[in-house]
Amino acid sequence: PHLRTFTDRFQTCKVQGAWPLIDNNYLNVQVTNTPVLPGSAATATSKLTIIFKNFQECVDQKVYQAEMDELPAAFVDGSKNGGDKHGANSLKITEKVSGQHVEIRAKYIGTTIVVRQVGRYLTFAVRVPEEVVNAVEDWDSQGLYLCLRGCPLNQQIDFQAFHTNTEGTGARRLAAASPAPTAPETFPYETAVAKCKEKLPVEDLYYQACVFDLLTTGDVNFTLAAYYALEDVKMLHSNKDKLHLYERTRDLPGRAA
Amino acid sequence: SPCKILKCNSEFWSATSGSHAPASDDTPEFCAALRSYALCTRRTARTCRGDLAYHSAVHGIEDLMSQHNCSKDGPTSQPRLHTLPPAGDSQERSDSPEICHCEKSFHKHSATPNYTHCGLFGD
């Protein structure tokens, strides 16, 4: 999937399996990514688990879990708030669009999370105070924490190189460079560009990610995934000058923060 | 899991988390942390060698070693100790989230926190 880190670095990651996105004293988020096509290095998010940790008089521990074709509007225990404590309503799930868009607000830690299902796959976006991000006591439990650190270098795909090389050609021509050797022939570059331009008129990294995804998979739902990801940034990002990113960051593993 | 490679990752990141990116004059310190990281992963090899997390760490170290021109031999570093408040601390602190009034939107003494954003989408 495409990752925008807490420090506005933008990477395309081929990480497969379960990886932590966020892990601190208050919140743990883990995603499971699966290949979008057989033999493809490109992966997308098929499962998301969010754990809001037990927090004094505010909330009990709550677990939210979404999978492909299952975007619940409740925690796994069936509740929609933080439990029985007097501050339980400082954690709330709201269903924005049934089966497609859920928002979780954790007021007690100033955090808003947006989870969507777009096509077969999930998207994730969060707005969180820096002091919550940095509230990490047990550093032994810190794994490959993607939102803070980015993806390891060997797990990154240089989609801009792919984008440059693919111009004016069908996706098949670049089977060797493409992370998806089985990318459909039916999606010429021009069509991908046109479809992405409809939703993403600014040629930023979200637009480029959209083109990459269409060429890689032939699945038009990825156009909407990029579009909604940008919409979520507009809603959640505190710096309105940084909504659009233009230069992809091929970062050092473990140094994206 | 018996594979403790994540402990190696965390020790490396805690040792290098003083700044967002190592400045050029931090390179010796960064290389020392990398060597510690490499040593830690070597120690886990027999327990983790078949697992993805182990190979991700090993390849990541190799990449970083070459990018920072680190020599394989040299001093190693100890991880930094972080003393942030635990989530369960019952006293209000300037460096922990609002705990007395859960419903207040994380504003302490009217101060607006610095927010940050992370997103994951597509393929």
Epitope: G17, T32 | S1, R43, R49
Partner: antibody, heavy 115, light 112 residues
Framework: EVQLVESGGGLVQPGGSLRLSCAAS????????MNWVRQAPGKGLEWIGM????????HYADSVKGRFTISRDNSKNTLYLQMNSLRAEDTAVYYC????????WGQGTMVTVSS | DVVLTQSPLSLPVTLGQPASISCRSS???????????LHWFQQRPGQSPRLLIY???TRFSGVPDRFSGSGSGTDFTLKISRVEAEDVGVYYC?????????FGQGTKLEIK
């Protein structure tokens, strides 16, 4: 919950072949090395071999080297053990186990080599 | 290949009493950096093996604290502080320091 289910065991003649499968669920199969271990009736455990998460390396016990082949299909979450040139002494319950250090095991499948 | 020799091969114990199993290796299982990859498995009657202790002394998740491991080099011990009925079965040591990996021949624990 981690689950490993072996299948493919049965009766085979000496010199024959058999392919065992191990279906994995409850964990991200493609992230882990996997092991095969066997246990002859009334005897102890014998490690057969292991395969890395991406099939890049395989290690075998001397007793099966050249006759047995471990493989995996990560897209199907399945581990395999191809057994050729079977001998009477290969009669055993065959277990698959998760991880470089085997932390979870299947229930096993019985292989009987007899004429 | 590394040979692991367990003793005793049979261990009758009274419920509530301690038990101790020895595992001796034909060569050192300690790597040059001091790490030792000696693990213990339990196999209850009719069941699959289960990881109890890894790297000499670390209990695997869910393993009761009455189980403990110790040792270094070539001599290792698994101890059960107070034997319970559910502890009946065969215990195996297993080394992963040297290829090929090898198991001990097993120690059968039974209740007196």
């Amino acid at each position: 919950e981690v689950q490993l289910v072996e299948s493919g065991g049965g009766l085979v003649q000496p010199g024959g072949s058999l392919r065992l499968s191990c279906a994995a669920s409850g964990f991200t199969f493609s992230n882990y090395g996997m092991n095969w271990v066997r246990q002859a009736p009334g005897k102890g455990l014998e490690w057969i071999g292991m395969i890395y998460y991406d099939s890049s390396e395989k290690h075998y016990a001397d007793s099966v080297k050249g006759r047995f082949t471990i493989s995996r299909d990560n897209s199907k979450n399945t581990l395999y053990l191809q057994m050729n040139s079977l001998r009477a002494e290969d009669t055993a319950v065959y277990y698959c186990a998760k991880g470089t250090t085997p932390d979870y095991w299947g229930q096993g499948t019985m292989v009987t080599v007899s004429s | 290949d590394v040979v692991l020799t367990q003793s005793p091969l049979s261990l009758p114990v009274t419920l509530g009493q301690p038990a101790s199993i020895s595992c001796r290796s034909s060569q050192s299982l300690e790597e040059s950096d001091g790490y030792t990859f000696l693990h213990w498995f339990q196999q209850r009657p009719g069941q699959s093996p289960r990881l109890l202790i890894y790297e000499v002394s670390t209990r695997f998740s869910g393993v009761p604290d009455r189980f403990s491991g110790s040792g270094s080099g070539t001599d290792f011990t698994l101890k059960i502080s107070r034997v319970e009925a559910e502890d009946v079965g065969v215990y195996y040591c297993f080394q992963a320091t040297h290829d090929p990996l090898t198991f001990g021949q097993g120690t059968k624990l039974e209740i007196k």
